[in-house]
């Protein structure tokens, strides 16, 4: 009769490289007396033995990956015990090899001279493709204008006319070489503002003329907006020379404005447009002078300007006497703090701070702001920023104000308009389109799992909301 | 107005499959998240599975993960429940229903609409 | 996983009479948490969600609050059409669960 023996793992499991959609297998030997029970793990998560994508065989010493995925990577175990000494283990990676793909393809751009076009270029593959561009018949040379972005974009600044032509980008790895379709880069030279209109600080019911000049290819027309409306008082002189046009708008000042002179001209089927705008304020605005708490025009600020919707226009709060400028202040204030909270948080916190500050607007006879949905509100409080959300009430609480959210003019979720009550009513927030390596796991989540299992949320498990490890009333 | 339909419920033996269908009207299913729950006779509600579609990501109750999937097609406006190795204890109603908004914030919103249920079976 | 223990499991009362029905849930939550009332052979209808929010359509009787992981259900003044199985449920990040139930029934 054999002689009880512990198990030993003869064949110890090494690194394994596989490419995508490819098989891939761990062997693990072992002998002991009796027969060992064999269990696997991916990152110290036990494998289950139902799991289709994974055949286990071999009394549990082979185990394959039936068609490798991206997401496999990782660190296998195999671990045998059959009651005789201890459970013994042996450990190998999983390395997945994938030729260069481009993922996001550049597409055709038409530019105006001047500008700067990005041509995207996306790519997949391990090792990391590098991403290099071609024009024409000829790699191309990055110079002081011309960069290609850590993404495998190409960056062209200040867009010349010499820049047109045919483009495609190339994708290169160790495993091989994947090759865009050719775009075509044209550069138009459109209608361009010569001079555009400067602000006034001016007393109430002060005269004011705001001055334009344009040139293009058909000579442009001008047209002027206050606070994103057609101009509804004051008068518009115009002359044309030499392919210039001057407009002078004159107007008699009662309220704050925002005036924007817009120079078009027609390419083709096309029109282009030039913009420039200026703002009329008023010295010493006083409460009586205003016939509503705001105005709506388009954000021309910094801060927000990628958070925010293109040419949305938003609210400014005329209890303010420069509401741009404070309100301006504030974000800017408020970006500073947000240095201090996590790359889970931040996004999603500038988003809801942009919007919250510079709400969506109405026009009309009363402007009126369209605040943030609560559900939105809720999910950035005790979803993206519970860590931070529960330091800063922590703080406060204690009266401490060292870092973090705590000088940010946040808004109270419980006093925003749901969805529910009505889906137009009220802001969502574009804070979802989280790049995949901006997540790893989320903070403060009470869960039987282990946090180092909580993925990004792709397609393979979900959150509908959260749990977070604090109370939030 | 909203309206979500179930189909694709009835008879089948233990260790057989079924595919349970939800037709959406009134909203589009790439903007909400779609749920489904089950509700065994004599018994409370117990959730399946839920679907965000616009992010493609699925979750799954224990008691059915491995053996179902969900699943949603855009274009039909219909999500779909797929039940394999089905046992005895998934008789119930099942049922599906909608919550507004994406993955993020359409668990503080509820499930506001509910189609009518549809019956399943399992049984030798 | 995190569980939700409502209480009571069913309760009799009359109309007019003001109701309180209670889930507690087993670990700290956030406020995605919603109540349901269920008739038999219907489909449940959506109350309260976020915790505290009447849904559309809803009679201002219904309120929801809570306290900590305590989350309440009220019925101020009890009518003959709500007699039914109410039904807490909170959605986690891994997961959504649903309270055992409360029905209840006319004294």
């Known amino acids: 009769e054999k002689l009880p023996k512990a198990p030993v793992i003869t064949t110890p499991l090494e690194t394994v490289d596989a490419l995508v959609e490819e098989v891939a297998t761990f062997m693990c030997a072992v002998e002991s007396y009796p027969q060992p029970e064999i269990s696997w793990t991916r990152n110290k998560i036990l494998i289950k033995l139902f799991d289709t994508r994974y055949s286990i065989r071999e009394n549990g010493q082979l185990l394959t990956i039936l068609s490798v995925e991206d997401s496999d990577d990782g660190i296998y175990c195999c671990i045998a015990n059959n009651g005789v000494g201890g459970a013994v283990e042996s450990c190998g990676a999983l390395q997945v090899k994938m030729k260069p793909k481009i993922t996001r393809p550049p597409i055709n751009v038409k530019i105006i001279e001047g500008l700067k076009a990005v041509l995207p270029c996306t790519t997949m593959g391990n090792p990391k493709p590098s991403v290099s561009w071609i024009k024409g018949d000829n790699a191309l040379r990055e110079n002081s204008r011309i960069a290609v972005l850590e993404s495998g974009s190409l960056r062209i600044h200040n867009v010349q006319k010499e820049d047109a032509g045919q483009y495609r980008c190339v994708a290169k790895n160790s495993l091989g070489t994947a090759y865009s379709k050719l775009v075509k880069l044209e550069v138009e030279v459109f209608a361009r503002i010569l001079r555009a209109p400067e602000s006034h600080n001016v007393t109430f019911g002060s005269f004011v003329t705001l001055r334009c000049t344009a040139i293009g290819i058909p000579v442009p027309t001008i047209s002027w907006i206050e606070n994103g409306n057609a101009v509804s008082s004051g008068s518009i002189q115009e002359s044309v020379k030499d392919r210039v046009i001057d407009s002078r708008l004159q107007l008699f000042i009662t309220k704050p404005g925002l005036y924007t002179c817009i120079a078009t001209n027609k390419h083709g089927e096309k029109f282009s447009t030039a913009k420039a705008a200026a703002t009329v304020s008023i010295a010493e605005w006083s409460k009586s002078q205003k016939d509503s708490q705001g105005y709506c025009a388009q954000y021309r600020g910094e801060v927000c300007d990628a958070v925010l919707a293109k040419d949305a226009l938003v609210f400014f709060n005329t209890s303010y006497r420069d509401p741009e400028d404070a309100q301006e202040l504030l974000i800017h204030t408020a970006w500073n703090e947000l240095k201090a909270v996590s790359p889970l948080c931040r996004p999603a916190a500038e988003a809801l701070l942009c919007n919250h500050l510079f709400q969506e607007c109405s026009p009309g006879v009363v402007p009126t702001p369209m605040p943030i949905c609560r559900e939105y509100c809720l999910a950035v409080k005790e979803l993206f920023c519970a860590k931070e959300w529960q330091a800063m009430e922590g703080k406060a609480h204690r009266g401490l104000y060292r870092s973090g959210m705590h000088l940010l003019p946040v808004p109270e979720c419980s006093k925003l308009p749901s969805m529910h009550r009505d889906p137009t009513a009220c802001t969502r927030l574009p804070y979802l389109d989280y790049k995949k390596e901006n997540i790893t796991t989320f903070p403060s989540i009470t869960s039987s799992r282990p946090s180092a299992d909580i993925p990004n949320l792709p397609a393979s498990t979900s959150s509908f909301a959260v749990s977070p490890a604090y109370s939030m009333t | 107005e909203v309206q979500l339909v179930e189909s694709g419920g009835g008879l089948v033996q233990p260790g057989g499959s079924l595919r349970l269908s939800c037709a959406a009207s009134?909203?589009?299913?790439?903007?909400?998240?779609i749920h489904w729950v089950r509700q065994a006779p004599g018994k409370g509600l117990e959730w399946v599975a839920s679907i965000s579609s616009s992010y493609g990501s699925t979750s799954y109750a224990d008691s059915v993960k491995g053996r179902f999937t969900i699943s949603a097609d855009t274009s039909k406006n219909t999500a779909y429940l797929q039940m394999n190795s089905l046992r005895a204890e998934d008789t119930a109603v099942y049922y599906c229903?909608?919550?507004?908004?994406?993955?993020?914030?359409?668990?503080?919103?509820?499930?506001?609409?509910w189609g009518q249920g549809t019956l399943v079976t399992v049984s030798s | 996983d995190i569980q939700m223990t409502q209480s009571p499991s069913s309760l009799s009362a009359s109309v007019g009479d003001r109701v309180t029905i209670t889930c507690r849930a087993s670990?700290?939550?956030?406020?995605?948490v919603a109540w349901y009332q269920q008739k038999p052979g219907k489909a449940p209808k959506l109350l309260i969600y976020?915790?505290?929010s009447l849904y559309s359509g809803v009679p201002s009787r219904f309120s929801g609050s809570r306290s900590g992981t305590d989350f309440t259900l009220t019925i101020s003044s009890l009518q003959p059409e709500d007699f039914a199985t109410y039904y807490c449920q909170q959605s986690g990040v891994w997961l959504i669960t649903f309270g055992q139930g409360t029905k209840v029934e006319i004294k």
């Open positions: 670990q700290s939550v956030s406020s995605a």
């Open positions: 229903a909608r919550s507004e908004g994406d993955r993020y914030v359409s668990g503080y919103m509820g499930m506001d609409y």
């Open positions: 976020s915790a505290s």
């Open positions: 009134g909203f589009t299913v790439s903007s909400s998240s």
